[in-house]
Interface confidence: low
């Protein structure tokens, strides 16, 4: 008999676009489906309602969009999740499932023209106003501005209905005024649970005429180093012009809120030709430690202070490096982006995350399993290396121990961490399983990813595998469904997928089959894997100067500019004196912070795989009910289960 | 009964190709890696390479580039591919599953093939 | 860069025992090893993977006779009440960094 399912985002938004997959397995002719989503429990509102009909023709699958609007049903209680009843009638046969409801309208980003301020000063600053998929949208915003004691001064309610999503907005800084980090924050009316915030500093200041750079030769401080801490000072003017003056340096140690100086560092030191060297020799940080063991200072860090005054003495710039961290491994092994699943028999997929000490991703570093060195790989620019090893038939757990294997570092310096894996639960302790897998490359928009559809299952069975049905989930919604095919005995199916802006930053992609199995119940077996995207520009946008190269601009003088970006795209600057990032460069809309914002509201919550099929939609974020009384777990909470400490 | 049996091996001339088959039975390409390992007349084993679960290989330095193995999982073969054959690659090939995930240990064996490289 | 050292040849006599060695290079001497037999004439067979704590797993088939121990860098294959059958090539291997590597290998000679 045929199996209906029905697919949606395990978390629904308000005011947004969703999709929902329908499929009718095993089935004949067409097949009529209504779609209707109600307010849970009372069922007494219809929010959306769609028609479709799922034909030979698609293979009997299909998708309906709908959108649940802002009514006052879902009006905020402090505590209280909403939920929404999805039911879809598939001819006469009802599957329904019960779908958290999300009041998160979209995202907005604060943009400041500075990073900091002096009292009586105004503050430039613009409000983004975007949906879901980063796309302007007209809503009430809630804006207040916070002193540094966390008190408001300032509160609006401002509609960006005809603003093309970009609030312009000002504020006049009192000549009396608390100095310190400021703090703008602003959320949607309907969702005021979910803050965006950015800050500024209050403070005088004088705009300096060079810029000083503190840079460690190596990002930590390595214990047994018998060379010390070498570190470099760079000095320029602002134009470009290399500084000559001297340099007053001072290093200490940091112990979380403490500081403990290191008087006989002090050193002056030459600034000849823009830059100077110093060292701190372990001997002058030992002994400025009392009872100087050197494994008590591990997982404290150095900072390192310096003054620069020009020759001619007509300014001086102070600027510091502080976190250098004291360390015994130079790297860290996470298994963050590794599944905490694995299917017996096998192939399982790694991704093993290294990290300098300072928390940034450690690039060309060898790591290998333990006791299976041939398995062995490099890690690229964003820290993460794939490592496969082949698993066993069994259902035990695996215990893996991953080493670095940088060839300059001794045994005791390699970094060493191990990770269990659970066995995926097959229904009915079946062997069928499925395994997907994604070559590990800095994937781009405009690139084809070949996605690895691997079978692992009992023969007898094999060949009434025909599809694999697949999901690709980004940003929260349902992006993509489709089908791959499969011909009887390919074990390895290969599905080519283009790669678009759509995908930034990461996407998710689910894959599952059904059958009939041995014990004559109706089976299905998932996978999915976490693919990170090169994050970049959706759009295209170029600023550069509209004059000849030879016409310099002049103060006091106008000069043109030229812009080029995506016709219809609504473009927005600001100019900033490069002075005032010498003296604060925090708090600066990037386009990463942007990327890590959406990442952060991903509903999906593994890199992949799960416990069972079930897991494995929930962990990815998603629903999956079906007519044969399979389906995936109530959600009950917006946020990912946080890990055990 | 889990077995592994080469074939494909003879006489050949310095500079010219052969192909090895290993054909497996009693187990699946698609649960275990497989490996090349070689064995000069009156000399120890010398490891070639290894083919993984899903196609990955690795070879010893020795062999990258002239030497390429790979799978035909519906017939449950691996090959040897052996290119710009010389002289000391006269040996008997064996080939072997490797079991286990944490350190794979060769098992079972092949008894071999023989392949002579003379002019 | 990983070795695995083994003396070329041992010899005992039957119905005693008998220790081989197999030496690791000391910046892998925690590594696991395995220990093959080639009989003459014959095909390599799989005797044993060998912990550097000193703990052992033994293939199908291969007799009691047969075990294994480790100290430091080095790991041993014992076989007592040698017969005649044992006599053979014993090769140790591990996987290493680059791959698979043997040692060179101990011819036994079983005396008289």
């Known amino acids: 008999s045929p199996m209906y399912s029905i697919i949606t985002p395990n978390i629904l938004r308000l005011e947004s676009e969703e999709t929902m997959v329908l499929e009718a397995h095993d089935a004949q002719g067409d097949v009529p489906v209504t779609v209707t989503v109600h307010d849970f429990p009372g069922k007494k509102l219809v929010l959306s309602s769609e028609k479709t009909v799922l034909t030979p023709a698609t293979n009997h699958m299909g998708n309906v969009t709908f959108t649940i609007p802002a009514n006052r049903e879902f009006k905020s209680e402090k505590g209280r999740n909403k939920f929404v009843t999805v039911q879809a009638t598939f001819g006469t046969q009802v599957v329904e499932k019960v779908v958290l409801v999300s009041l998160q309208s979209g995202y907005l980003f604060i943009q400041t023209d500075k990073t900091i301020y002096t009292p009586g000063s105004t503050v430039l600053y613009r409000i983004f106003t975007v949906n879901h998929k980063l796309l302007p949208v007209g809503r009430t915003v809630m804006v207040n501005i916070e002193n540094p004691e966390g008190i408001p001064v300032k509160q609006d309610s401002l509609s960006s209905q005809n603003q093309l999503g970009v609030l312009p907005l000002s504020w006049d800084i009192p000549e009396l005024v608390n100095m310190g980090q400021w703090k703008i924050r602003a959320y949607y009316e309907n969702s005021p649970q979910q803050v965006f915030s950015t800050e500024f500093e209050v403070k005088e200041y004088v705009l300096p005429s060079f810029e000083v750079i503190v840079e460690p030769t190596e990002k930590f401080y390595y214990i047994y180093n018998e060379k010390g801490l070498e570190v470099t000072i760079t000095a320029r003017f602002l134009y470009g012009k290399k500084v000559e003056g001297t340099a007053f340096v001072i290093f200490g140690i940091q112990d979380g809120e403490q500081r403990i100086s290191l008087p006989e560092s002090l050193k002056r030191i030459p600034i000849e030709d823009g830059s100077g060297e110093v060292v701190l020799s372990r001997k002058v940080l030992l002994d400025g430690v009392q009872n100087p063991r050197a494994e008590d200072l591990v997982g404290k860090s150095l900072y390192v202070s310096a003054t620069v005054i020009l020759h001619s003495g007509s300014d001086m710039v102070q600027a510091e490096r502080s976190g250098i961290p004291i360390v015994t491994s130079p790297y860290q092994i996470h298994f963050t982006k590794t599944p905490k699943y694995f299917k017996p028999g096998m192939p399982f997929d790694l991704m093993v995350f290294v990290t300098n000490p300072d928390g940034s991703p450690a690039y060309r570093v060898p790591v290998a399993v333990q006791g299976e060195d041939t398995v062995q790989s490099l890690t690229q620019g964003d820290g993460v290396a794939k490592l496969s090893i082949n698993t066993h038939p069994s259902q035990k757990p695996l215990s893996i121990t991953v080493r670095t294997k940088k060839q300059e570092l001794s045994e005791a310096e390699q970094a060493t961490r191990t990770m269990q894996a659970l066995p995926y639960s097959t229904v009915g302790n079946s062997n069928n399983y499925l395994h997907l897998s994604v070559l590990r490359t800095e994937l781009r928009p405009g690139e084809t990813l070949n996605v690895n559809f691997l079978l692992r299952m009992d023969r007898a069975h094999e060949a009434k595998i025909r599809y694999y049905t697949y999901l690709i989930m980004n940003k929260g919604r349902l992006l993509k469904a489709g089908r791959q095919v499969r011909e009887p005995g390919q074990d390895l199916v290969v599905l080519p997928l283009s790669i678009t802006t759509d995908f930034i930053p990461s996407f998710r992609l689910v894959a599952y089959y059904t059958l009939i199995g041995a014990s004559g119940q109706r089976e299905v077996v998932a996978d999915s894997v976490w693919v990170d995207v090169k994050d970049s520009c959706v759009g295209s946008l170029v600023v550069k100067s509209g004059q000849s190269e030879d016409r310099q601009p002049v103060p006091g003088q106008q000069m043109t500019l030229k812009i080029e970006g995506d016709h219809g795209a609504r473009v927005v600057l600001v100019a900033v004196d490069k002075g005032v990032f010498v003296l604060n460069k925090k708090n600066k809309l990037t386009q990463s912070k942007i990327w890590d914002v959406v990442e952060k509201a991903d509903i999906g919550c593994t890199p992949g795989s799960g416990k069972d099929y079930a897991g494995v939609f929930s962990d990815a974020g998603l629903t999956f009910t079906s007519s044969s009384g399979q389906q995936t777990a109530q959600r009950a909470e917006l946020q990912c289960p946080q890990p055990a400490a | 009964q889990v077995q592994v049996v080469e074939s494909g091996g003879g006489s050949v001339q310095p500079g010219r190709s052969l192909r090895l088959s290993c054909a497996v039975s009693g187990f699946s390409l698609y649960n275990y890696a497989m490996n090349w390992v070689r064995q000069a007349p009156g000399k120890g084993l010398e490891w070639i390479g290894i083919i993984n679960v899903g196609g990955g290989t690795n070879y010893a330095s020795w062999a990258k580039g002239r030497f390429t193995i790979s799978t035909d999982n519906s017939k449950n073969t691996v090959y040897l591919q052996m290119n710009s054959l010389r002289a000391e690659d006269t040996a008997s090939y064996y080939c072997?599953?490797?079991?286990?995930?944490?350190?794979?240990?060769?098992?079972?064996w092949g008894c071999g093939t023989s392949v002579t490289v003379s002019s | 860069q990983l070795v695995l050292t083994q003396s070329p040849s041992a010899s005992a006599s039957l119905g005693a025992s008998v220790k081989l060695t197999c030496t690791l290079s000391s910046a892998h001497k925690t590594y696991t090893i395995d220990w093959y037999q080639q009989q003459p004439e014959k095909c390599p067979r799989y005797l044993m993977q060998?912990?550097?704590?000193?703990?052992?797993t033994k293939g199908t088939g291969v007799p009691d006779r047969f075990s294994g121990s480790s100290s430091g860098a080095e790991r041993y294959l014992t076989i007592s009440s040698l017969q005649s059958e044992d006599e053979a090539d014993y090769y140790c291997?591990?996987?290493?960094?680059?791959?698979?590597?043997f040692g060179g290998g101990t011819k036994l000679t079983v005396l008289g």
């Open positions: 072997a599953r490797a079991v286990g995930y944490h350190h794979a240990r060769l098992d079972p």
């Open positions: 060998l912990k550097s704590e000193g703990s052992y």
């Open positions: 291997g591990t996987e290493g960094v680059g791959g698979y590597v």
